[in-house]
């Protein structure tokens, strides 16, 4: 066989580490630097054996799906991205990953990618609110951040509930505390409102703005400032993969090419 | 639609140089590994050199090794063959075609004589 | 390398006829992955080849289904049933089971 002028690019699999909460999609990206006219891709987890365990598999503009349907390879539109995506993902889902690639004839060759790992966490955080699930990747510390941020809220609402009461049972020892907000001057909201700090790519929105117009309320002459925690629930920005699902082919393929241009 | 485009064929002495060049259209270039094949004065086909997608890789024919080099531009969507010490014998049409392996299309063709 | 040899000629054929145009490799081209690595293209007079059969059995897009392909690991056939006019021309086998990709030396089909 002529070997070529130079040696193959390596097949990349990021992210490098992942980690999502149970019942949450992990999913990584498998890379080809080059596209040959045919070959096969395999993702893989590694054994605690060291030996790799095939989840999945693309070939020839098939997709082979494994033992288990939740795990699912899908082609991207570029050719030569793939996404490896794991489906609600499990507890005992964390692991060491790759994906493999083999060329077939005439290049005939075997390539690894470097191994990436997923931690799947337990779900700790569930706002009776939220309708979309909350994003993966919450670092440790990130997870203390919620926590606190969570307790503080409580604190503000029962303070908020005890000066209400107060106010209620005792209405004169009000009578003199200002009314935050007139009608000559409405609290602010709209464009003058506070910057929006969005943290994307699967990580937790803070979104610091001022309180909303309410009823007048008795309060303070200070104006408290509220931190809402936001999941984010909208279409995917730039940051953020797109659901691998969601990814449409542009044109048919041209199956005597071989795999080398659309997804399936 | 697919079309391929050869151009630089010409009449050049034994031990000279050309350039080709493959100008692509109709499916996205840089997803496809790309082939020269040579046919020779007696129609027997010959591959000359293929070259990968990202150009990581490239294949060459022993008969053209050392003196032949394949190249693309896939921002110009354009395929190379850079032909030096030509001997008579490479005297043919060349042809770009689409694939490593499987030359699912093929160009019209260039044609290079090489003769005293 | 690979060598790939080719009768030159068929026996001219009579239009509406089928013709077997034979291959042979000295190398089996039957890879593990159970494909077998053999291309068959036609070159019409005056034309660039054209892609009929790839991986031994299937018709590229766009080819006549009186057009198929056969054979075992080193041992290939393409068969044309009901041949037409514009059937004419060279028909070539390549391998592609490993570099240098080789073609045969085409077959010329000719019509009585």
């Known amino acids: 066989l002529d070997s070529p002028d130079r040696p193959w690019s390596p097949l990349t699999f990021s992210p490098a580490q992942l980690t999502v909460q149970e019942g949450e999609n992990a999913t990584f990206t498998c890379s080809l630097a080059d596209i040959p006219d045919s070959f096969v891709l395999n993702w893989y987890r590694l054994s605690p054996r060291n030996q790799t365990d095939k989840l999945a598999a693309f070939q020839e503009d098939r997709i082979e799906p494994g033992r288990d349907r939740r795990f699912r390879v899908t082609r991207l539109p570029n050719g030569r991205d793939f996404h490896m995506s794991i489906v609600a993902a499990r507890l005992n889902d964390s692991g060491i990953y790759l994906c493999g690639a083999i060329y077939l004839p005439p290049n005939t060759q075997i390539n690894e990618s470097p191994r990436a790992e997923l931690s799947v966490t337990e779900r700790t955080l569930e706002p009776p609110t939220q309708s979309p699930s909350p994003p993966p990747r919450l670092s440790g510390q990130l997870q203390g951040l919620v926590i606190g941020v969570t307790s503080v809220l409580v604190g503000v609402l029962l303070l908020l509930l005890l000066t209400w009461v107060l106010a209620a049972v005792f209405p004169r020892a009000t009578r003199g505390a200002c009314v935050c907000g007139s009608e000559d001057e409405p609290l602010k909201e709209g464009p003058d409102a506070a910057p929006v700090f969005t943290l994307d790519y699967g990580e937790l929105d803070f979104q610091w703005r001022e309180k909303t117009p309410e009823p007048p309320a008795p309060c303070a002459p200070e104006q408290t400032e509220y931190a809402t925690i936001v999941f984010p629930g909208r279409p995917a920005s730039p940051g953020r993969r797109a659901s691998a699902s969601s990814l449409q082919g542009a044109q048919p393929p041209s199956p005597e090419d071989g795999p080398g241009l659309w997804p399936p | 639609e697919v079309q391929l485009v050869e151009s630089g064929g010409d009449l050049v002495k034994p031990g000279g140089s050309l350039k080709l060049s493959c100008v692509a259209s109709g499916f996205p270039f840089s997803n496809f590994g790309m082939s020269w094949v040579r046919q020779t004065p007696d129609k027997r086909l010959e591959w000359v050199a293929t070259i990968s997608s990202g150009s990581s890789y490239s294949y060459y024919s022993d008969s053209v090794k050392g003196r032949f080099t394949i190249s693309r531009d896939n921002a110009k969507n354009t395929l190379f063959l850079q032909m030096n010490s030509l001997k008579s014998e490479d005297t043919a049409i060349f042809y770009c075609?689409?694939?490593?392996?499987?030359?699912?299309?093929w160009g019209q063709g260039t044609l290079v004589t090489v003769s005293a | 390398d690979v060598v790939i040899t080719q009768d030159e000629l068929s026996n001219p054929v009579t239009s509406g006829e089928s013709v077997s145009i034979s291959c042979r490799s000295n190398k089996s081209l039957l890879y593990e992955d159970g494909q077998t690595y053999l291309n068959w293209f036609l070159q019409r007079p005056g034309q660039s080849p054209q892609l009929l059969i790839y991986l031994m059995s299937t018709r590229a897009s766009g080819v006549s289904d009186r057009f198929s392909g056969s054979g075992s690991g080193t041992d290939f056939t393409l068969e044309i049933s009901e041949v037409r006019a514009e059937d004419v021309g060279v028909y070539y086998c390549q391998q592609l089971i490993e570099y240098p990709l080789t073609f045969g030396a085409g077959t010329k089909l000719e019509l009585k």
């Open positions: 075609a689409r694939g490593e392996s499987r030359f699912a299309y």
